[in-house]
Amino acid sequence: MKVLQEPTCVSDYMSISTCEWKMNGPTNCSTELRLLYQLVFLLSEAHTCIPENNGGAGCVCHLLMDDVVSADNYTLDLWAGQQLLWKGSFKPSEHVKPRAPGNLTVHTNVSDTLLLTWSNPYPPDNYLYNHLTYAVNIWSENDPADFRIYNVTYLEPSLRIAASTLKSGISYRARVRAWAQCYNTTWSEWSPSTKWHNSYREPFEQH
């Protein structure tokens, strides 16, 4: 039994780090493998993660992380019974994938303006709270070509757009994701999408 693709890990910088790897053949990850992880800190204990299957030869492990800080560094040991298959390390702050924003709401009652709001997925005392910026994806259910991305580079989790920038009388969907430049994170997953019917008063044309 050998590791074909070494574990790579990302952290939500709050509670979970996810490590994925591939074996050289079909593997029952949960019965055959264990991923041990330990904070590099005096007297820190080792924790065991039981991996789940992620495709035939793929495995995934969700590591519960202690109260994460930027200096934290973990040793990782992948075992098959008594055989050490791989040894590595992981610094959560250098491999961050933020949590997805939540509670995306489209407010359509603001005089021909669409107001999209969502919630920051971190509590105020988490380092990422004040460092997230967002991308909002809006698309038409009727027209696949009507697909747009708005970059929200300010901290407030909201976006205002004129309803007239979208077509009237059709349904749209929106979703939002986050990233933090300060930690050079990857993008979060997209939030669940929300749907609304876009309608606005066409400006009166004078002849």
């Epitope: 820190s44 519960l64 202690d66 109260d67």
Partner: antibody
Framework: EVQLVESGGGLVKPGGSLRLSCAAS????????MNWVRQAPGKGLEWVAR??????????YYADSVKDRFTLSRDDSKNTLYLQMNSLKTEDTAVYYC???????????WGQGTTVTVSS | DIQMTQSPSSLSASVGDRVTITCSAS??????LNWYQQKPGKAPKLLIY???SLHSGVPSRFSGSGSGTDFTLTISSLQPEDFATYYC?????????FGGGTKLEIK
């Protein structure tokens, strides 16, 4: 072996005070966040409070039902967690569990609990 | 606050049965859901974290699934020691909240 041992429970009159303690052993207490969770007689579980580690400035969080009445603290040199409970109400009657937090709310070890009874 | 609703509130089953308990969140919590087991007079024990990850030392007959708002705990073949009360808990947002519990009894 991880061990959490609560103490300090007892019978107290409404408006009174109690201080619960939780002695921790078998793990690196000073790097872990800790919680208190309670369970009223015959009822479900209710999260009460959380305290983070020193590296996160001992930040505390409280359920609305206990905010401004309960105070959470820790002494890392003694591996001990404390819950100071003031202005106690009858609805605070419960078994109080000390828990280790292994990731912003995933509580992997629990003490055996200490019973607090608030009654006149 | 996020409300967690478990069903059923009680359940009778026999040793060897396959049992499913469901938990519903009042809003999307991604996969930030834990399951605990509690026996009478004892403290709860963590069974499953992050929806489907088995906590160390927990038998593989326990499994979890779901995402978003709907989650499931499954015991593939009930053992005598599994008769207990089970709680789900979200750790997406403070305050962390628990379901009302499902009491699993011997038929």
């Amino acid at each position: 072996e991880v061990q959490l041992v609560e103490s300090g429970g007892g019978l107290v009159k409404p408006g009174g005070s109690l201080r619960l303690s939780c002695a921790a052993s078998g793990f690196t207490f000073n790097t872990n966040a800790m919680n208190w969770v309670r369970q009223a007689p015959g009822k479900g579980l209710e999260w009460v409070a959380r305290i983070r580690s020193k590296s996160n400035n001992y930040a505390t969080y409280y359920a609305d039902s206990v905010k401004d009445r309960f105070t959470l603290s820790r002494d890392d040199s003694k591996n001990t967690l404390y819950l100071q409970m003031n202005s106690l109400k009858t609805e605070d009657t419960a078994v109080y569990y000390c828990t280790r937090d292994r990731g912003w709310g995933a509580m992997d070890y629990w003490g055996q609990g200490t019973t607090v009874t608030v009654s006149s | 606050d996020i409300q967690m609703t478990q069903s059923p509130s009680s359940l009778s089953a026999s040793v060897g049965d396959r049992v499913t308990i469901t938990c519903s969140a009042s809003q999307d919590i991604n996969n930030y859901l834990n399951w605990y087991q509690q026996k009478p007079g004892k403290a709860p024990k963590l069974l499953i974290y992050y929806t489907s990850s088995l906590h160390s030392g927990v038998p593989s007959r326990f499994s979890g699934s779901g995402s978003g708002t709907d989650f499931t705990l499954t015991i593939s073949s009930l053992q005598p020691e599994d008769f207990a009360t089970y709680y789900c808990q979200q750790f997406s947002n403070l305050p962390w909240t628990f379901g009302g519990g499902t009491k699993l009894e011997i038929k």
